[in-house]
């Protein structure tokens, strides 16, 4: 993961560019952990990045991701209480030029070096779940969420709204 000074340069570069025709409205750094407080970490191996879900040793520093928030250009088609806000999508980048990417064919979550504009597979609809947890739904495959399977991130199909709070698709964001 990159240091703060690198992030500031990177953030500025992102703001200066237009991604899928839009720029992020907000960006900040956060660490990502599971509902059970395991950390999501990123390691460079053989010139590609691997994603791990693991318990960190005491005092071990958490990896940070740059969360970039984008307003959907289309109003949500959900019925409800007349909400007039625009749906938010996020991209997650643990290091410069690499973004989390949904591979729907393999049901996997991968880190890809992406050219701008970013592909739709890099965008996730953000959901607020219980206990200050969030979930990430694939823009390209509604009903499919980033989840934890066998100590790795995977894509998990959620069949009904009752299953939205299943622990393996719940994540915590922490800025500390």
């Amino acid at each position: 993961a990159f240091g703060i000074s690198g992030v500031q340069k990177y953030t500025r570069a992102l703001h200066d560019s237009s991604i899928t025709g839009i720029s992020p409205i907000t960006e900040y750094l956060a660490s990502l952990s599971t509902y059970n407080d395991q950390s999501i970490t990123f390691a460079l191996e053989d010139e590609s990045y691997e994603i791990y879900v693991e318990d960190l040793k005491k005092d071990e520093k958490k990896d940070k991701v740059l969360l970039s928030y984008y307003e959907s250009q289309h109003p949500s088609n959900e019925s409800g209480d007349g909400v007039d806000g625009k749906m938010l999508m996020v991209t997650l980048s643990p290091t410069k030029d690499f973004w989390l990417h949904a591979n729907n064919k393999e049901h996997s979550v991968e880190l890809h070096k992406c050219e701008k504009p970013l592909p739709d597979q890099a965008f996730f609809v953000l959901h607020n779940m219980h206990s200050n947890c969030v979930s990430f739904e694939c823009k390209t495959d509604p009903g499919v969420f980033i989840g934890v399977k066998d100590n790795h991130l995977a894509l998990i199909k959620v069949d009904s709204s009752e299953n939205l709070c299943t622990e393996n698709i719940l994540f915590k964001l922490s800025e500390t």
Partner: nanobody, 121 residues
Framework: QVQLVESGGGLVQPGGSLRLSCAAS????????MGWHRQAPGKQRELVAV???????NYADSVKGRFTISRDNTKNTVYLQMNSLRAEDTAVYYC???????????????WGQGTLVTVSS
């Protein structure tokens, strides 16, 4: 429906200070972040500062060391303390919040109407 109401804008001399407030109300379930953007005449809207529910902050380079963002989570209110104001800070300041409502888990972006800050002698 989620409403954001800003206050605190006005005319101030260069070097002066102002404090903006923004209160969110409505059927709010969870707020992910609250922040301030600004738009000067003839320019694009730009991020000024953001504070997350966990207290993390991010500032535009042009305001670092002069502006401070803070948030009262219990009141769903965000504040922007602006010190050492310059003429180039003149803009309409908009409050922005990312939140979900009781009717949906989906996080949405909401905007206030804006408050004008004019820095001039």
């Amino acid at each position: 429906q989620v409403q954001l109401v800003e206050s605190g804008g006005g005319l101030v001399q260069p070097g002066g200070s102002l404090r903006l407030s923004c209160a969110a109300s409505g059927s709010i379930r969870t707020v992910n972040y609250m922040g301030w953007h600004r738009q000067a005449p003839g320019k694009q809207r730009e991020l000024v500062a953001v504070v997350t529910s966990g207290g993390g902050t991010n500032y535009a380079d042009s305001v670092k060391g002069r502006f401070t963002i803070s948030r009262d989570n219990t009141k769903n209110t965000v504040y922007l303390q602006m010190n050492s104001l310059r003429a180039e800070d003149t803009a309409v300041y908009y409050c922005n919040a990312a939140a979900s409502t009781y009717s949906s888990t989906v996080v949405r972006s909401f905007w206030g109407q804006g408050t004008l800050v004019t820095v001039s002698s």
